[in-house]
């Protein structure tokens, strides 16, 4: 059974950094591209980033480009999101997800809340 | 970036009645593989999103056949033939044809009392 579990969220001051993790199990992690998607409180979904199955290719939303870095460790079946220069508008629940675009099933974690506040 | 515009933003529907949500993209969503990558998601209250439809009209396994997707180019529609209580939530379209991927603002489906 596919399982995605995010962790690392919390309260952080503006300008500071935070690293989110997503532990994957129940599937061949090394064969799948992985995404981060966020949702600000009471707001809609915003796609954040994708990383290719082997970590060779990454794309980001303009709002996080240059501040956030998506990475993965296939030996640990773990996806990461390194967030720096955090702003109040980065406050959101962050979800890791698999197969947003293609395939017959998509998978999402339960989300981890990041609050950027002084 | 490709702008995705959904309408309406709020949709009150009577149980058993049909519902229709529109999604317009600022650019064609035909990808280099020849497919149109327009995806629909449902997010029920307090839950993570889940994909309902991919490539405009392909239903994800396990999604009831009352959900259907249609459209081409820049105009797309999600239809629910007979709304049920469990369909309450927010519906989002997503384009997966151009970087960065972008979501629509969401359409909140509510049941009319």
């Amino acid at each position: 059974q596919v399982h995605l579990v995010e962790s690392g969220g919390g309260v952080v001051q503006p300008g500071r950094s935070l690293r989110l993790s997503c532990a994957a199990s129940g599937f061949k992690f090394r064969s799948y591209g992985m995404h981060w998607v966020r949702q600000a409180p009471g707001k809609g979904l915003e796609w954040v980033a994708i990383i290719w199955y082997d970590g060779s290719k990454r794309y980001y939303a303009d709002s996080v480009k240059g501040r956030f870095t998506i990475s993965r460790d296939n030996s640990k079946n773990t996806l990461y999101l390194q967030m720096s220069s955090l702003r109040a508008e980065d406050t959101a629940v962050y979800y890791c997800a698999r197969d947003l675009i293609t395939g017959t099933t998509d998978y999402w974690g339960q989300g981890t809340l990041v609050t950027v506040s002084s | 970036d490709v702008v995705m515009t959904q309408s309406p933003l709020s949709l009150p529907v009577t149980l058993g009645q049909p519902a229709s949500i529109s999604c317009r993209s600022s650019r064609s969503l035909v990808y280099s593989d020849g497919n149109t990558h327009l995806i629909w998601f449902q997010q029920r209250p307090g839950q993570s999103p889940r994909r309902l439809i991919y490539r405009v009209s392909n239903r994800v396994s396990g999604v009831p056949d009352r959900f259907s997707g249609s459209g081409s180019g820049t105009d797309f529609t999600l239809k629910i033939s007979r709304v049920e209580a469990e369909d309450v939530g927010v519906y989002y379209c997503l384009q997966g044809a151009h970087w960065p991927y972008t979501f629509g603002q969401g359409t909140k489906l509510e049941i009319k009392r």
Epitope: V2, F27, K28, R30, S31, Y32, G33, M34, I50, I51, W52, Y53, D54, G55, S56, K57, N74, D99, I101, T102, G103, T104, T105, Y107 | D33, S61, G96
Partner: antibody
Framework: DVKLVDSGGGLVKPGGSLKLSCAAS????????MSWVRQTPEKRLEWVAT????????YYPDSVKGRFTISRDNAKNTLYLQMGSLKSEDTAMYYC????????????????WGQGTSVTVSS | DIVLTQSPASLAVSLGQRATISCKAS??????????MNWYQQKPGQPPKLLIY???NLESGIPARFSGSGSGTDFTLNIHPVEEEDAATYYC?????????FGGGTKLEIK
């Protein structure tokens, strides 16, 4: 236009070595995983090796593991297959192929192939 | 290793008719609801050409008369209506599990 040109094949004695090359053009080479597939004289297709787009990961079937090495030079847009301890059963047409992009996923489907280079292992 | 058995080994079909090629896997090639089965066409003196990926997805530029279906261990390639240029050998390939294996091929002749 995507183009893959295989070279380096030839006649080699059992136990010998050979290095195949595949020159790629018409696409961003560093964005794609690449594979080698061979076709035996009986027309049977066999997957030989795969290398991920960045070159971080390599995969082989047991039949060539430890004898063959796949590598790539993204600056030169070139894929390689170093073959060692060659056996008569390695005689085949060797094709380099591009792995189909799957929105970040590894699909294992090969969407473009070179014209092939023939390898004959014989004493 | 997963063994792929194609049938028939050869078939002759009249122009405009349907050609159906079967590929049976010795174990399931599905993963998370996705069928990791691909289909290729090979003409004499040419390399293989991808037709269908992930069981049912038509590769870009391939005519819609080609279609793939199936799941688990049973997969099918259909060509309808068959045209003269479809005379070739067709191979299935699974990419669910290392080593990625091919079927033995099906030779299609046009009557």
């Amino acid at each position: 236009d995507v183009k893959l040109v295989d070279s380096g094949g030839g006649l080699v004695k059992p136990g010998g070595s050979l290095k195949l090359s595949c020159a790629a053009s018409g696409f961003t080479f560093s964005n794609y995983g690449m594979s080698w597939v061979r076709q035996t004289p009986e027309k049977r297709l066999e997957w030989v090796a795969t290398i991920s787009s960045g070159g971080y990961y390599t995969y082989y079937p047991d039949s060539v593991k430890g004898r063959f090495t796949i590598s790539r030079d993204n600056a030169k847009n070139t894929l390689y297959l170093q073959m060692g301890s060659l056996k008569s059963e390695d005689t085949a047409m060797y094709y380099c192929s591009r792995d189909r992009e799957g929105f970040g996923n590894y699909l294992g489907a090969m969407d473009y192939w070179g014209q092939g280079t023939s390898v004959t292992v014989s004493s | 290793d997963i063994v792929l058995t194609q049938s028939p080994a050869s078939l002759a079909v009249s122009l405009g008719q349907r050609a159906t090629i079967s590929c049976k896997a010795s174990q399931s090639v599905d993963y998370d609801g996705n069928g990791y089965m691909n289909w290729y066409q090979q003409k004499p003196g040419q390399p293989p050409k991808l037709l269908i990926y992930a069981a049912s997805n038509l590769e870009s530029g391939i005519p819609a008369r080609f279609s793939g279906s199936g799941s688990g261990t049973d997969f099918t390639l259909n060509i309808h209506p068959v045209e003269e240029e479809d005379a070739a050998t067709y191979y299935c390939q699974q990419s669910n599990e290392d080593p990625y294996t091919f079927g033995g091929g099906t030779k299609l002749e046009i009557k």
